[in-house]
Amino acid sequence: HEGVHRKPSLLAHPGRLVKSEETVILQCWSDVMFEHFLLHREGMFNDTLRLIGEHHDGVSKANFSISRMTQDLAGTYRCYGSVTHSPYQVSAPSDPLDIVIIGLYEKPSLSAQLGPTVLAGENVTLSCSSRSSYDMYHLSREGEAHERRLPAGPKVNGTFQADFPLGPATHGGTYRCFGSFHDSPYEWSKSSDPLLVSVTGNPSNSWPSPTEPSSKTGNPRHLH
């Protein structure tokens, strides 16, 4: 009877991009008082772990600690809640969470086509490139949960590049990019050096990111 209860949430602390040998904690939680959580990992081996739910302040949760991250533990995870001892009566699955191991290959370069300081409203494009034949590039912005991704294309100078059009500049931020190969989607390169994009100009035209608190001053906003 899958889906008897609404789906739990699945989070990664400190985040879903994990360096080799570092610690990551996967947390299943819900406002339904689940007795158990099932943590399922898709991949070459399909693995399911049964975790005992802890109840505090109207929330049930369970933590799965990976003390040392390896390539073998990367993959797509989902969490299910169970209110009985039967493993067959489980909730709907949580949204999938991709746990990615980073730092495996050489870092790409990240640059802003018009330079790192732009006028408010100006179109911004960030370019990620490398001599490594990456199939895909992933662009992350500090403070945002999800990365943008684009396929890499070969350039005449022997590099593989992707150009990320960010649209009209409204707010600054710190960006990083990663490269990956088609056959190994959960294994990414080292991070590029961070790129701080600054937006200058009339602050009234400057809209904050949904994940960034509004600035109360007229100064340009920078994410460090």
């Epitope: 070459m44 399909n46 073998d72 533990l73 056959d183 190994s184």
Partner: antibody, heavy 116, light 111 residues
Framework: EVQLVQSGAEVKKPGSSVKVSCKAS????????ISWVRQAPGQGLEWMGG????????NYAQKFQGRVTITADESTSTAYMELSSLRSEDTAVYYC?????????WGQGTLVTVSS | QSVLTQPPSASGTPGQRVTISCSGS????????VNWYQQFPGTAPKLLIY???QRPSGVPDRFSGSKSGTSGSLAISGLQSEDEADYYC???????????FGGGTKLTVLA
């Protein structure tokens, strides 16, 4: 340096079972998959199944489903492979190997001879 | 019979370049990476190439791997007598949910 050390050679009767151990040292045992691969005399390599110790769920090749049991003991960093209902065709060298996407470290191998 | 097909034998003289092919299908090599292992008689296999073209540390750059479509290839340039061994390709098969190995290729270095 990662090392996988396997138990010694075994001679078994047809119909019996064998349990081979693989002790890991020098790495993070729980976070890496351990697979079992066998090689009959003069033949190629054949994957039997594997386990990621931190999860504890074994995955088996269809050919060996129901006849092989793979387990892992995190407290001793040891993986085990038990093969039941042995027949003469199971005579082979059995290897444990570390890794999920590739096998970067291998045990020295355990020769299992099935003979009446 | 292996689902990944390799030539049973290959040979070359010292200094030559030899290639060993590994043919699969869309459910294995077509969607997953190819690994190559080297095995000397009486010893355990050794990882030679992983993720199609990556070399573990300590493996000479004379060894290289590539993949195209549903086939993989191992190239050995500047062949040396110590390269005489058996070579196996391997790929995960999504349909079978298991690892497949090629039948192996015995490489002979001719004097």
């Amino acid at each position: 340096e990662v090392q996988l050390v396997q138990s010694g050679a075994e001679v078994k009767k047809p119909g019996s079972s064998v349990k081979v151990s693989c002790k890991a040292s020098g790495g993070t045992f729980s976070s890496y998959a351990i697979s079992w691969v066998r090689q009959a005399p003069g033949q190629g390599l054949e994957w039997m199944g594997g386990i990621i110790p931190i999860f504890g769920t074994a995955n088996y090749a269809q050919k060996f489903q129901g006849r092989v049991t793979i387990t892992a003991d995190e407290s001793t960093s040891t993986a085990y492979m038990e093969l039941s209902s042995l027949r003469s065709e199971d005579t082979a060298v059995y290897y444990c190997a570390r890794g999920l996407r590739f096998f970067d470290y291998w045990g020295q191998g355990t020769l299992v001879t099935v003979s009446s | 019979q292996s689902v990944l097909t390799q030539p049973p034998s290959a040979s070359g003289t010292p200094g030559q370049r030899v290639t060993i092919s590994c043919s699969g299908s869309s459910s294995n090599i077509g969607t997953n990476t190819v690994n190559w292992y080297q095995q000397f008689p009486g010893t355990a296999p050794k990882l030679l190439i992983y993720s199609n073209n990556q070399r573990p540390s300590g493996v000479p750059d004379r060894f290289s791997g590539s993949k195209s479509g549903t086939s993989g290839s191992l190239a050995i340039s500047g062949l040396q007598s110590e390269d005489e061994a058996d070579y196996y390709c391997a790929a995960w098969d999504d349909s079978l949910q298991g690892w497949l190995f090629g039948g192996g290729t015995k490489l002979t270095v001719l004097a």
